[in-house]
Interface confidence: medium
């Protein structure tokens, strides 16, 4: 005959652990049911009664199976200049991210306290390292034989076109100009763009006893442009 299935609450065998989605209650000394995501423990279990769960209230959540006495508060509302990339629901925290073309320059565990515009490399300079969610663009001077004629946070230095006969030689901020005969080799027209940083969620640990992590919430500080850095513009 198959072994009898124990229903919560039950006393575990010595040396054994509680099953999946159960926890050991130290007071009752029993294995008891956890509450599902979106719920919390309203009444803890006893030797004779199981955990009583209740739904999270508005603006609170639990992300994992848990036995927390109260749900976690969703992070602060996103500011008007931010993008809410994940709404606050009973099962997930709100996530706010810096808007496209911006990055997080000052953060705390709760999220980003300061979003700043990505540096733009001025003509004669190209992107050496693209911006990410948490780091600014790094610009570098265009090496001989390459140029950038844009003010951009994504454009890299591109090779000069090679002419049969050069009308105007290229420099760091301008492509070579060929005479009316077509060039022998030309790069694809238009600026070469680096991809914008892909949003990634940072994580921070929830207070015990729920052994889970919750995505942090980012916050935007409205601000003016950054001061120009070498090879960059704050405009």
């Amino acid at each position: 005959l198959p072994a009898q299935v124990a229903f919560t609450p039950y006393a575990p065998e010595p040396g054994s652990t509680c099953r999946l989605r159960e926890y050991y209650d130290q007071t009752a000394q029993m294995c008891c049911s956890k509450c599902s995501p979106g719920q919390h423990a309203k009444v803890f279990c006893t030797k004779t009664s199981d955990t009583v769960c209740d739904s999270c209230e508005d603006s609170t959540y639990t992300q994992l199976w848990n036995w927390v006495p109260e749900c976690l508060s969703c992070g602060s509302r996103c500011s008007s200049d931010q993008v809410e990339t994940q709404a606050c629901t009973r099962e997930q925290n709100r996530i706010c991210t810096c808007r496209p073309g911006w990055y997080c320059a000052l953060s705390k565990q709760e999220g980003c306290r300061l979003c700043a515009p990505l540096r733009k490399c001025r003509p004669g300079f190209g992107v050496a390292r693209p911006g990410t969610e948490t780091s600014d663009v790094v610009c570098k001077p265009c090496a001989p034989g390459t140029f950038s004629n844009t003010t951009s946070s994504t454009d890299i230095c591109r090779p000069h076109q090679i002419c049969n006969v050069v009308a105007i030689p290229g420099n760091a901020s301008m492509d070579a100009v060929c005479t009316s005969t077509s060039p022998t080799r030309s790069m694809a027209p238009g600026a070469v763009h680096l991809p914008q940083p892909v949003s990634t969620r940072s994580q921070h640990t929830q207070p015990t006893p729920e052994p889970s992590t919750a995505p942090s919430t980012s916050f935007l500080l409205p601000m003016g442009p950054s001061p120009p850095a070498e090879g960059s513009t704050g405009d």
């Epitope: 320059a105 000052l106 709760e110 306290r113 300061l114 700043a116 500080l221 442009p225 950054s226």
Partner: antibody, heavy 120, light 111 residues
């Protein structure tokens, strides 16, 4: 309007602990930090740490680590600062203050202060 | 820790005259074009009151005779025309990084 109301004055013996409360009203308590700052008589201001009531995350000044505990009760919008192993030099006025998560990033509203006297 | 040093320690100014207080940080308190330096006023028996946030922004309800300027490590609080009610101790404070720190304070009196 934003208001922070602190608990009353305390007299403690060296080695004891003190727990000061700070009840917030007029804004969403879980949205912004509560900072704790102390000021000894005739002295300057000293930041002790802060708590984010939404998650309970705390940030302590290393000087007070191991002696200070900051907690909150969301249901009554109240933050607490407990300082243990008190010594005479902990005699000071203890302030709570609100610091917005974004925007000013400064302490824009303050409690009235709680005088803690440590004396044998 | 970032150390903030205010000068002078005390200042006596005639009514209607300009008062200037300086605050120097041991390292930059700037980040991406923002200066995380703030100024507070404290009168006897009262908690501090925020006057200026992020170096130059006037807090709501604060008279416009108060102004702030500066960047990186050097900051200034100016009272353009001192009034009797401005007698107080003024503190600078940085919130660029933990632990947040305050200057030692500057006492402003009437000459």
């Amino acid at each position: 309007q934003v208001q922070l109301v602190q608990s009353g004055a305390e007299v403690k013996k060296p080695g004891a602990s003190v727990k000061v409360s700070c009840k917030a009203s007029g804004y969403t308590f879980t949205d912004d930090y509560i900072d704790w700052v102390r000021q000894a008589t005739g002295q300057g201001l000293e930041w002790m740490g802060e708590i984010y009531p939404g998650s309970g995350n705390t940030y302590y000044n290393e000087k007070f680590k191991g002696r200070v505990t900051m907690t909150r009760n969301k249901s009554i919008s109240t933050a607490y600062m407990e300082l243990s192993s008190l010594r005479s030099e902990d005699t000071a006025v203890y302030y709570c203050a609100r610091s917005q998560v974004y925007g000013k990033i400064a302490m824009d509203h303050w409690g009235q202060g709680t005088l803690v006297t440590v004396s044998s | 820790d970032i150390v903030l040093t205010q000068s002078p320690d005390s200042l006596a100014v005639s009514l209607g005259e300009r008062a200037t207080i300086n605050c120097r940080a041991s390292e930059s308190v700037d980040n991406s074009g923002n200066s995380f330096m703030h100024w507070y006023q404290q009168k006897p028996g009262q908690p501090p009151k925020l006057l200026i946030y992020r170096a130059s922004n006037l807090e709501s309800g604060v008279p416009d005779r108060f102004s702030g300027s500066g960047a990186r490590t050097d900051f200034t609080l100016t009272i353009s025309s001192l009034q009797a009610e401005d007698v107080a101790v003024y503190y600078c404070q940085q919130s660029k990084e933990d632990p947040y720190t305050f200057g030692q304070g500057t006492k402003v009196e009437i000459k």
